[in-house]
């Protein structure tokens, strides 16, 4: 057999057979590669639902290449059919001549029958392939219209967007001179605000000297009053004399003992000076008062005569205290006290005080905190905290706040902060917002000292979370 | 096995004293905080002192301070309570307990108690 | 001094049945909280500390939850050898305990 194509049917094949004088001529149909096999949800049509349209690289090439494999199969089965054909033919045509020639035309013609049923089979099943590619080609070239149109829609939104960064770079521009502008006014008051400052310093200096002068002066009366307690006190002894001698010399049987005028003393420094010089409770008296008041005086460290003005060892007294408590004084000299804010109030606003702040661990350290000026303001000015000068071992930071803060009480909040800090980590102090301190908070024994927000706390010395085991404050004139 | 056994309990007049013991087995005493908690009759139970491992810290309850005064001997494995100026609301079952190891207050294991009776 | 207040003060429970005991603080002891359990004539056991944690050898029924100011302890299957008084205990502030629940047979 031999293998042909007619140039004016190029898409076809002819399969000849030449058996003796007949000769068979088939027509067959041949791939031209516009087919595709039918697929099942290959991919996502709708392809306006996705941000990027789904693209499968080369699918038309992947997919013609897989039918041209399909049509070699076809063909070579079609070789192997007509293979049979000959070789049938071959015995058929032998036994034919032997029977008769005229059973020949009709057994030829039966094959051919049979031949071409099969091939009009095989061409129907190409006319299916082919549609189902005609198919898929135009779903291709609607996914590619709905990528088109998704392209020009991302196309636009990049203009409007090139055209809005284009007015926002505008109004940028525009906002840049508003604040170079606002700078230079800025410029301009930081400067005048300058001028003040310096102004103001000139005026706080000659307000310091004149402050300094009046110290001095205040001092120097301090001296000349006790200089006329001294005389006073001499002279009520040589009358309360006179007047013992006046009474013997008048009734020899009703002698009058003269009361002797007990002398009063501020603060434990004058306690200290008089001669009194063992650790104790004393009595003191508020300056240009007649009241009293009881203090623990230490007589022993760092000199002597310090007046100690809270204390905290074992957790016996409760320092969670009103505003009155806390003004006039509470728990026990000889253990655990506050000494009262308006005793050291008057007291440091006479002369210049020192404070010290004795602090212990857990863990048998000590430390000290010492101001060389301390004072509190009036109950008026809620007992306000003055502090100046930091030296000592307990932090190079003041634990009190500065520029000192007033006092504050579970039933005084005057504090910074819109919690009242007196309420949630206990005990009056000078809180701030709420500060690295409180030396009258919650007493924690040992074990239970850490991590504890509300305990006896110096921030700067053992942290936030750590509550101290014992605590001292104790003043003492600077000039001591 | 840890044990602990309490003694020196029984009547007393009010104003007396007592010397309570304990006596610890099967486990380090001077590894352990020890404390004493009392159980009134019928009624619930209340810490009434504690003593650090070395004795250098001790803690009492308001109600007994400048009265009662817990100590230890580590040596002899041992714990007191000495109780003085007795008053009829100290009569109590009185537990010695082992702190549990690192803990602030953890009563791990107790003894079986001593009754103290303050009565006239 | 921070109070312990328990409720309710007796509970009556079917034996198998489930068992909740509360717990009050007067304020925050974070989770600073245990549970002991005493029986008659003999001293406390500890069941649970830390709110949640169980002590060596206790049972699985035993659960404890809760932090802050308010805790539970539950038994979900009462054993004839769980009635008894149970007291819950802060160690956050100094010691103090609850005035117990006791729980019986119903």
């Known amino acids: 057999s031999n293998q042909r194509r007619s140039p004016e049917n190029s898409g076809r094949r002819y399969n000849r057979i030449q058996h003796g004088q007949c000769a068979y001529t088939f027509i067959l149909p041949e791939h031209d590669g516009n087919c595709r096999e039918s697929t099942t949800d290959q991919y996502n049509t709708n392809a306006l639902q996705r941000d990027a349209p789904h693209v499968e690289p080369d699918f038309s090439s992947q997919k013609l290449q897989h039918l041209e494999h399909v049509m070699e199969n076809y063909t070579q089965w079609l070789q192997k059919l007509e293979n049979y054909i000959v070789e049938n033919m071959k015995s058929e045509m032998a036994q034919i001549q032997q029977n008769a020639v005229q059973n020949q035309t009709a057994v030829m013609i039966e094959i051919g029958t049979n031949l071409l049923n099969q091939t009009a089979e095989q061409t129907r099943k190409l006319t299916d392939v082919e549609a189902q590619v005609l198919n898929q080609t135009t779903r291709l070239e609607l996914q590619l219209l709905e990528h088109s149109l998704s392209t020009n829609k991302l196309e636009k939104q990049i203009l409007d967007q090139t055209s809005e960064i284009n007015k926002l770079q505008d109004k940028n521009s525009f906002l840049e001179k508003k604040v170079l502008a606002m700078e230079d006014k800025h410029i301009i008051q930081l400067q005048s605000i300058k001028e003040e400052k310096d102004q103001l310093q000139v005026l706080v200096s000659k307000q310091n000297s004149i402050i300094e002068e009046l110290e001095k002066k205040i001092v120097t009366a301090t001296v000349n009053n006790s200089v006329l307690q001294k005389q006073q006190h001499d002279l009520m002894e040589t009358v309360n004399n006179l007047l013992t001698m006046m009474s013997t010399s008048n009734s020899a049987k009703d002698p009058t003992v003269a009361k002797e005028e007990q002398i009063s003393f501020r603060d434990c420094a004058e306690v200290f000076k008089s001669g009194h010089t063992t650790n104790g409770i004393y009595t003191l008296t508020f300056p240009n008062s007649t009241e009293e008041i009881k203090a623990y005086c230490d007589m022993e460290a760092g000199g002597g005569g310090w007046t100690i003005i809270q204390r905290r060892e074992d957790g016996s007294v409760d320092f969670q205290r009103t505003w009155k408590e806390y003004k006039v004084g509470f728990g026990n000299p000889s253990g655990e006290y506050w000494l009262g804010n308006e005793f050291v109030s008057q007291l440091t606003n006479q002369q210049r005080y020192v404070l010290k702040i004795h602090l212990k661990d857990w863990e048998g350290n000590e430390a000290y905190s010492l101001y060389e000026h301390f004072y509190l303001s009036s109950e008026e000015l809620n007992y306000r905290i003055h502090l100046k000068g930091l030296t000592g071992t307990a932090g190079k930071i003041s634990s009190i706040s500065q520029p000192g803060n007033d006092f504050s009480t579970k039933d005084g909040d005057n504090d910074k902060c819109i919690c009242k800090c007196s309420q949630m980590l206990t005990g009056g102090w000078w809180f701030d917002a709420c500060g690295p301190s409180n030396l009258n908070g919650m007493y924690y024994p040992q074990r239970q000292n850490t991590n504890k927000f509300n305990g006896i706390k110096w921030y700067y010395w053992k942290g936030s979370g750590y509550s101290l085991k014992a605590t001292t404050m104790m003043i003492r004139p600077a000039d001591f | 096995e840890v044990q602990m056994v309490e003694s020196g309990g029984g009547l007393v007049q009010p104003g007396g004293s007592l010397r309570l013991s304990c006596a610890a087995s099967?486990?380090?005493?001077?590894?352990?905080?020890m404390s004493w908690v009392r159980q009134a009759p019928g009624k619930g139970l209340e810490w009434v002192a504690n003593?650090?491992?070395?004795?250098?810290?001790?803690y009492h309850v308001d109600s007994v301070k400048g009265r009662f005064t817990i100590s230890r001997d580590n040596a002899e494995n041992s714990l007191f309570l000495q109780m003085s100026s007795l008053r009829a609301e100290d009569t109590a079952v009185y537990y010695c307990a082992r702190d549990m190891e690192a803990s602030a207050g953890l009563f791990d294991y107790w003894g079986q108690g001593t009754l103290v009776t303050v009565s006239s | 001094e921070i109070v312990m207040t328990q409720s309710p003060a007796t509970l009556s429970v079917s034996p198998g049945e489930r068992a909740i005991l509360s717990c009050r603080a007067s304020?925050?002891?974070?989770?600073?909280l245990a549970w002991y359990q005493q029986k008659p004539g003999q001293a406390p056991r500890l069941l649970i500390y830390g709110a949640s944690t169980r002590a060596t050898g206790i049972p699985a029924r035993f659960s404890g939850s809760g932090s802050g100011t308010e805790f539970t302890l539950t038994i979900s299957s009462l054993q004839s050898e769980d009635f008894a008084v149970y007291y819950c205990?802060?160690?956050?502030?100094?010691?103090?305990f609850g005035q117990g629940t006791k729980v019986e047979i119903k």
């Open positions: 205990q802060q160690y956050n502030y100094w010691w103090t």
């Open positions: 099967g486990f380090t005493l001077r590894s352990y905080w």
């Open positions: 304020q925050s002891i974070s989770s600073n």
């Open positions: 003593i650090k491992e070395d004795g250098s810290e001790k």
